[in-house]
Interface confidence: low
């Protein structure tokens, strides 16, 4: 009786089980009673990542620099190209089909975590004793200047956006 199901890495065609093509190869012709499945390797810039019966290999993904993408891992005959974002950008989705600019942290906020290819900049408010006076995707909050260590006194208090202003101590005559 003809089989109704085939083993792993086989497929059912014309009431018989044929071997699937291995990853990196495409199907040229199905097996027959007398011949094995015929497979051919994928061409350059093509891939198939599973045991398959595909007659065409898939094109490697193109990491479009106009979308801010670059190659993170070059594709092989068995794997697709993996794209990531250029420096200063991060992916808009897990598939990384396009990128957006990393967020800058505004004055009064510092960078808690620098952006990566997949996550945006994480900003944090500068706590008391710290400040940031720039909009930056790199800069952390800076500590206020310690006037005392310079033998000076605070003339103007610092804020989350400005450093303290130090000045000379009043001398008793």
């Amino acid at each position: 009786e003809p089989p109704t199901a085939c083993r792993e890495k086989q497929y059912l065609i014309n009431s018989q089980c044929c071997s699937l093509c291995q990853p990196g190869q495409k199907l040229v012709s199905d097996c027959t009673e007398f011949t094995e499945t015929e497979c051919l390797p994928c061409g350059e810039s093509e891939f198939l990542d599973t045991w398959n019966r595909e007659t065409h290999c898939h094109q490697h993904k193109y990491c479009d620099p106009n979308l801010g993408l670059r190659v993170q891992q070059k594709g092989t005959s068995e794997t697709d190209t993996i794209c990531t974002c250029e420096e200063g950008w991060h992916c808009t989705s897990e598939a990384c089909e396009s990128c957006v600019l990393h967020r800058s942290c505004s004055p009064g906020f510092g960078v808690k975590q620098i952006a990566t290819g997949v996550s945006d900049t994480i900003c944090e408010p500068c706590p008391v004793g710290f400040f940031s006076n720039v909009s930056s995707a790199f800069e952390k909050c800076h500590p206020w200047t310690s006037c005392e260590t310079k033998d000076l006194v605070v003339q103007q208090a610092g804020t989350n956006k400005t450093d303290v202003v130090c000045g000379p101590q009043d001398r008793l005559r």
């Epitope: 106009n66 950008w89 600019l101 800058s104 620098i114 909009s135 790199f138 800069e139």
Partner: antibody, heavy 119, light 112 residues
Framework: QVQLVQSGAEVKKPGSSVKVSCKAS????????MNWVRQAPGQGLEWMGN????????NYNQKFKGKTTLTADKSTSTAYMELSSLRSDDTAVYYC????????????WGQGTLVTVSS | DIVLTQSPDSLAVSLGERATINCRAS???????????LHWYQQKPGQPPKLLIY???NRFFGVPDRFSGSGSGTDFTLTISSLQAEDVAVYYC?????????FGQGTKLEIK
């Protein structure tokens, strides 16, 4: 190929304003920050600021803040730099320059626009 | 602001000889991501600057391999291994790690 084409030379009176344009082609305009750099006659280069054309976010050199306004028109792939309250020391060549992504450097430059401020 | 100081201000070198231009930064240009945000540009009279070297050592597209960048932290060098007539220009270093981005004052390179 990437091209940045700037508007022509301008002669302006002190106290007036000027708006210089920079038309981009050969790449996705919204994908790259546009920078502006000033070069006074016989002098070096000064970075004025930049704009992200996608969001319209700007970063200014403090020296040019209040003096300079950067804008971008996504529909025409054109960046603009407006200088107000012109003085004779604003006489300079103004360049637009694209910020390369992975490079984080100014990879392509416009041909420059000479702005002359004279009464 | 970060100050970039180039030396010398001008330089005359014979054709085929090595030319070296230095750039010193008032603070480190090395980011925590290990990149050094120091770049070099060439400007010929009446033309816009052209990017030569980005992020310390990387040659931009189409730049001849006689141009190379080196250095670390705060001290950087642009080297032209064998000077050609077309290399006569003003050369600028630039940093893009801290806003405002700044340029060196320029070094004028001439043929001896």
């Amino acid at each position: 190929q990437v091209q940045l084409v700037q508007s022509g030379a301008e002669v302006k009176k002190p106290g007036s304003s000027v708006k210089v344009s920079c038309k981009a082609s050969g790449y996705t305009f919204t994908g790259y920050n546009m920078n502006w750099v000033r070069q006074a006659p016989g002098q070096g280069l000064e970075w004025m600021g930049n704009i992200d054309p996608y969001y319209g976010n700007t970063n200014y050199n403090q020296k040019f803040k209040g003096k300079t306004t950067l804008t971008a028109d996504k529909s025409t792939s054109t960046a603009y730099m407006e200088l107000s309250s012109l003085r004779s020391d604003d006489t300079a060549v103004y360049y637009c320059a694209r910020l390369g992504l992975q490079l984080y450097a100014l990879d392509y430059w416009g041909q420059g626009t000479l702005v002359t401020v004279s009464s | 602001d970060i100050v970039l100081t180039q030396s010398p201000d001008s330089l005359a070198v014979s054709l085929g000889e090595r030319a070296t231009i230095n750039c010193r930064a008032s603070q480190s240009l090395v980011h925590s991501n290990a990149n050094t945000y120091l770049h070099w540009y060439q400007q010929k009279p009446g033309q816009p600057p052209k990017l030569l070297i980005y992020k310390l050592t990387n040659r931009f597209f189409g730049v001849p391999d006689r141009f190379s960048g080196s250095g670390s932290g705060t001290d950087f060098t642009l080297t032209i291994s064998s000077l050609q007539a077309e290399d006569v220009a003003v050369y600028y270093c630039q940093q893009s790690i801290h806003v405002p981005w700044t340029f060196g004052q320029g070094t004028k390179l001439e043929i001896k």
